[in-house]
Interface confidence: medium
């Protein structure tokens, strides 16, 4: 499994992982105590046939070509959690591992 | 976690799981000894903002709105394996569990 990494200067048109810092403060999300910002990354780019396909299933659906199947799209294929400190709805402070907050790899699925 | 299930008569335009039988015989993939066909399913439909979003990350990227982020797309969010009997490149018969061959759930990511 591998995926492409790009940045804002890249000319890559294919599915790629780009850097993105999410800033909770800028969103006005004050219930998040920490972190105030974190590196989330995101996926963007074209999914030519077979390029970076995560699953054999993606290839099979392309082969079978059913009505309405739009072809694969560039989406996270590996994600990781971050630890966060935040207020829940009852205004209790919670410290927890929040899954799937960081994109580690992008692929076509 | 939940996802919509549709069939060929559905009028649902949103991200949905549709039935699809993959027929290896019809593809001429005779190196696959068994199964000759299986229920693979596929994902299709529109991803309106927040509908069926699998990850908080999806929402955050939408909020941050970086250059080139295309918005979420309808993609498998839960997949399961099938057992297969096939010839490898050395013409040895292999029996194994092949991951991510069946779409169990679709969502927007």
């Amino acid at each position: 499994d591998f995926g492409l990494d790009c940045d804002e200067h890249s000319t890559e048109s294919r599915c790629c992982r780009y850097p993105l810092t999410v800033d909770f403060e800028a969103f006005g999300w004050d219930w998040i105590i920490a972190p105030k910002r974190y590196k989330a990354n995101y996926c963007s780019g074209e999914c030519e046939f077979v390029f970076l396909q995560k699953y054999p299933h993606t290839h099979l659906v392309h082969q079978a070509n059913p009505r309405g199947s739009a072809g694969p799209c560039c989406t996270p294929t590996k994600m990781s959690p971050i630890n966060m400190l935040y207020f829940n709805g009852k205004e209790q402070i919670i410290y927890g591992k929040i899954p799937a907050m960081v994109v580690d790899r992008c692929g076509c699925s | 976690d939940f996802g919509l299930d549709c069939d060929e008569h559905s009028t649902e335009s949103r991200c949905c799981r549709y039935p699809l039988t993959v027929d290896f015989e019809a593809f001429g993939w005779d190196w696959i000894i068994a199964p000759k066909r299986y229920k693979a399913n596929y994902c299709s439909g529109e991803c309106e903002f927040v509908f069926l979003q699998k990850y908080p990350h999806t929402h955050l990227v939408h909020q941050a709105n970086p250059r080139g982020s295309a918005g979420p797309c309808c993609t498998p969010t839960k997949m399961s394996p099938i057992n297969m009997l096939y010839f490898n490149g050395k013409e040895q018969i292999i029996y194994g569990k092949i991951p991510a061959m069946v779409v169990d759930r679709c969502g927007c990511s």
């Epitope: - | 290896f24 005779d30 696959i32 000894i33 068994a34 199964p35 000759k36 057992n83 010839f87 013409e91």
Partner: antibody, heavy 124, light 107 residues
Framework: QVQLVQSGAEVKKPGASVKISCKAS????????MHWVRQAPGQGLEWIGN????????NYNQRFKAKATLTVDKSTSTAYMELRSLRSDDTAVYYC?????????????????WGQGTLVTVSS | DIQMTQSPSSLSASVGDRVTITCKAS??????LSWFQQKPGKAPKSLIY???RLVDGVPSKFSGSGSGQDYTLTISSLQPEDFATYYC?????????FGQGTKLEIK
């Protein structure tokens, strides 16, 4: 429907060879194992071997390794078995049979279709 | 090679009888056992696979059971068309091996 049609009866002299055929129809020939089984007069069934037509990969009963050669012609969907150095005790009915996979395990098979059999008589 | 011992080698029974044929393997065959019926001058016909599963189109009067080394075929109510020779086959290991057959005759 799925059918296996075998070639007609043969009479051969000891030491000769014979090639019998099994023509498949009604299914994708290359994707199913073809097995061969023999039955001597008044006797039981004996497994000779099998072949996967897609790539010609075959397995033989050690007892028949020097006796039988299994081949296929994909263009005509036909399986062949050649028997060499014939002796009188090779006199038998020879059957081809398709092996069908029904399950999820490595040995989940059964014979779903048989040929009608080819009688090979070896006599001087 | 795995040896398959079938018993009895012949059996006389009457129409309406219930009969049982047994097959013993020389080692555990993990239920990879099939049963066949053969009539004179005809190819064998598959009845049961995986020890107890009925082949499509085979009447339910035929049933199979067993595990490990010991297996049985039962015909619940014999009809005239059931008088034939029956064979078992193990497919757990190459070479595949058949039992020597049980000839079922009308009494």
């Amino acid at each position: 429907q799925v059918q296996l049609v075998q070639s007609g009866a043969e009479v051969k002299k000891p030491g000769a060879s014979v090639k019998i055929s099994c023509k498949a129809s009604g299914y994708s020939f290359t994707g199913y194992f073809m097995h061969w089984v023999r039955q001597a007069p008044g006797q039981g069934l004996e497994w000779i071997g099998n072949i996967y037509p897609y790539n010609g990969v075959s397995n033989y009963n050690q007892r028949f390794k020097a006796k039988a050669t299994l081949t296929v012609d994909k263009s005509t969907s036909t399986a062949y078995m050649e028997l060499r150095s014939l002796r009188s005790d090779d006199t038998a009915v020879y059957y081809c049979a398709r092996r069908y996979y029904y399950g999820t395990g490595p040995a989940d098979w059964y014979y779903d279709v048989w040929g009608q059999g080819t009688l090979v008589t070896v006599s001087s | 090679d795995i040896q398959m011992t079938q018993s009895p080698s012949s059996l006389s029974a009457s129409v309406g009888d219930r009969v049982t044929i047994t097959c013993k393997a020389s080692q555990d065959i993990n239920s990879y056992l099939s049963w066949f019926q053969q009539k004179p001058g005809k190819a064998p016909k598959s009845l049961i696979y995986r020890a107890n599963r009925l082949v499509d189109g085979v009447p339910s009067k035929f049933s199979g059971s067993g595990s490990g080394q010991d297996y049985t075929l039962t015909i619940s109510s014999l009809q005239p068309e059931d008088f034939a020779t029956y064979y078992c086959l193990q497919s757990d290991e190459f070479p595949l091996t058949f039992g020597q057959g049980t000839k079922l005759e009308i009494k």
